[in-house]
């Protein structure tokens, strides 16, 4: 499937998914959204945070010197999103071992701005993205993913830290955006909705999809997130929609069928490793990019993101699994954890593809009114 | 010699409890994956349950057959392997091996040492 | 769970036969496939890990092929002592899954 008034060569379906910000992301207004701190949930805007990787939530890569390559988790800040009282079950918080920094969630107080400062900054993410208003860049070239096929052993953590459901990867997965822009791949998570009420946190023209999944990187020049965070490129995300579709998604079940294990907050299993890029789209070169910033607290911005035009497809079923299984603090379901769409304030989306060209009716005439910046030269 | 020793089989009744046992000997304990297979008479080999090693955490895997009824565990100073088995069916009845796989240099799960078995008849 | 199909059930072949046995994953588990050998009254054997490698000490006839969800396990000359029940088991997640076992015979 296409994303809306894709081009119809750009399937926005039937892949994977996996963007995650390493930090995390606050319910900041939207484009869309009045730009009010604590945007109350649309129809399909709700407002949801959950614990991406957020600072405490980012693994830490050592410097090769050192004896374990291993990627870490680092004890980053957690922040409390700002809550939404309409929605009582959107308060997942994280709370984790050893963490100093107060806590946040999706709804409520505090407000994100609070916990940091950085979430009321003026590039901060998720967006809405117009495909007709995209600049279609030439220079975005194929992602190159090396290393994601991971073999059963050794396993993976896959834990329930109050915001999302977070997958822990090992080192060796190594990502390249383009020529000298390459990355680490730290952790995925996913942001869903609830029964009937879709939870990515992009939108495509205003429009809402089921779930999405991040999947967090470093760059290859910082040995650690927290040297990264705020700085122009430190972390890239991958970013992909999961829609529903008629048959069973093996990749995702190998994750799904687990959730049960760790429906309690702060719970965690291992689970066999996995062909990481099944759980994304099979087109690595349609995508739209753009800087923002982590999603939840401490909303650093400087990250680039990288949003699949195809999506993945998963079964009714397991979407269901995904926004009905875990729980969050207060023994709230753990659901509608995605942020407000945040305003783009002068940014301009950039497209792998001539995105604003569009077969459908309903742009005749497609005007591409953005121009390339060469991103990636 | 790599060894594993199977133990503590018998005729148990529907409903009862059996504790079995597996000696391992022969390389180092804590490093291994260790899992219990059995095979019913005259049928094909079910694995029944898994214990992590020292870098994975001891922690425990069941298959949906047993789940909430057997318990695996281990005792990595006595170098022993155990099966806790509770609520006994007819159908639990078989051959039970002890078996090594998976370690700190696999890539995967498979089974490259196994016991002799031990006998488990549960029966009225 | 991975289910596992082997073929055929049984088999019989001559002394010095080519025998060939056939296992099918329902999903991709890439290489992760291991062949055993269990003759009557004894504990299973690992023969093939890794879809095509060797276990230690398993003779030279004794081989593996395939990828994703087809596997093939081969003996290329048969001898009077590969009379056994020949079994696949995947290793890609759990709950660990076999096939449900070739009986091998002598004509």
């Known amino acids: 499937q296409r994303l809306p008034r894709m081009q119809e060569d750009s399937p926005l379906g039937g892949g994977s998914s996996g963007e995650d910000d390493p930090l995390g992301e606050e319910d900041l207004p939207s484009e869309e959204d009045s730009p009010r701190e604590e945007d109350p949930p649309g129809e399909e805007d709700l407002p949801g945070e959950e614990d991406l990787p957020g600072e405490e939530d980012l693994p830490e890569v050592k410097p090769k010197s050192e004896e374990e390559g291993s990627l870490k988790l680092e004890d980053l800040p957690t922040v409390e999103a700002p809550g939404d009282p309409q929605e009582p079950q959107n308060n997942a918080h994280r709370d984790k071992e050893g963490d100093d920094q107060s806590h946040w969630r999706y709804g409520g107080d505090p407000p994100w701005p609070r916990v940091s400062p950085a979430c009321a900054g003026r590039f901060q993410s998720p967006v809405d993205i117009r495909p007709q208003l995209a600049a279609f860049c030439p220079a975005l070239r194929p992602l190159e993913l090396l290393g994601f096929q991971l073999p059963p052993l050794p396993e993976l953590r896959l834990r329930n830290n109050g915001h999302s459901v977070q997958l822990t990867l090992p080192p060796g997965l190594e990502m390249a955006l383009g020529p000298g822009r390459e990355y680490r791949a730290l952790q995925l998570h996913l942001h869903w909705g609830a029964a009937g009420r879709p939870g990515s946190e992009h939108t495509v023209e205003g429009h809402r999809f089921p779930a999405e999944i991040h999947v967090v990187h470093l760059s290859t020049a910082f040995a650690r997130v927290d040297e990264a965070l705020g700085r122009p490129g430190g972390l890239a995300v991958l970013a992909a929609f999961l829609e529903e579709g008629p048959e069973e998604n093996s990749a995702y079940e190998q994750l799904l069928s687990r959730l049960e294990e760790i429906a309690e907050e702060g719970s965690e299993t291992q689970v066999p490793g996995l062909d990481i890029s099944a759980l994304l789209p099979s087109d690595f070169s349609r995508y739209f990019q753009y800087e923002g910033s982590l999603t939840t607290p401490p909303c650093a911005q400087g990250v680039i993101w990288t949003v699949f035009n195809q999506t993945v497809m998963l079964s009714a079923k397991q979407l269901h699994t995904l926004s009905d299984t875990l729980w969050g603090p207060g023994d709230s379901r753990l659901q509608l954890n995605f942020r407000a769409t945040q305003p783009l304030n002068g940014r301009v989306i950039e497209a792998s593809f001539p995105a604003g060209v569009d077969s459908s009716p309903r742009a005749a005439e497609p005007v591409q009114l953005n121009s390339c910046l060469a991103a990636g030269d | 010699e790599v060894q594993l020793v199977e133990s503590g089989g018998g005729l148990v009744q529907p409903g009862g409890s059996l504790r079995l046992s597996c000696a391992a000997s022969g390389f180092t304990f804590t490093d291994y994956y260790m899992h219990w297979v059995r095979q019913a008479p005259g049928r094909g080999l079910e694995w029944v349950a898994f214990i992590r090693n020292k870098a994975s955490g001891y922690t425990p895997q069941y298959s949906a057959s047993v789940k909430g009824r057997f318990t695996i565990s281990r005792d990595n100073a006595e170098n022993s392997l155990y099966l806790q088995m509770n609520s006994l069916r007819a159908e639990d009845t078989a051959v039970y091996y002890c078996?090594?796989?998976?370690?700190?240099?696999?890539?995967?799960?498979?089974?490259?040492?196994w016991g002799k078995g031990t006998t488990v008849t549960v029966s009225s | 769970d991975i289910q596992m199909t082997q073929s055929p059930s049984s088999l019989s072949a001559s002394v010095g036969d080519r025998v060939t046995i056939t296992c099918h994953v329902s999903?991709?588990?890439?290489?992760?496939l291991s062949w055993y050998q269990q003759k009557p009254g004894k504990a299973p054997k690992l023969l093939i890990y890794q879809a095509s490698n060797l276990h230690t000490g398993v003779p030279s006839r004794f081989s593996g092929s395939g990828s994703g969800t087809d596997f093939t396990f081969t003996i290329s000359s048969l001898q009077p002592e590969d009379i056994a029940t020949y079994y696949c088991q995947q290793g890609q997640s759990y709950p660990f899954t076999f096939g449900q076992g070739t009986k091998l015979e002598i004509k």
């Open positions: 078996v090594r796989g998976g370690h700190a240099g696999s890539n995967y799960w498979y089974f490259d040492v």
């Open positions: 999903q991709n588990i890439n290489v992760w």
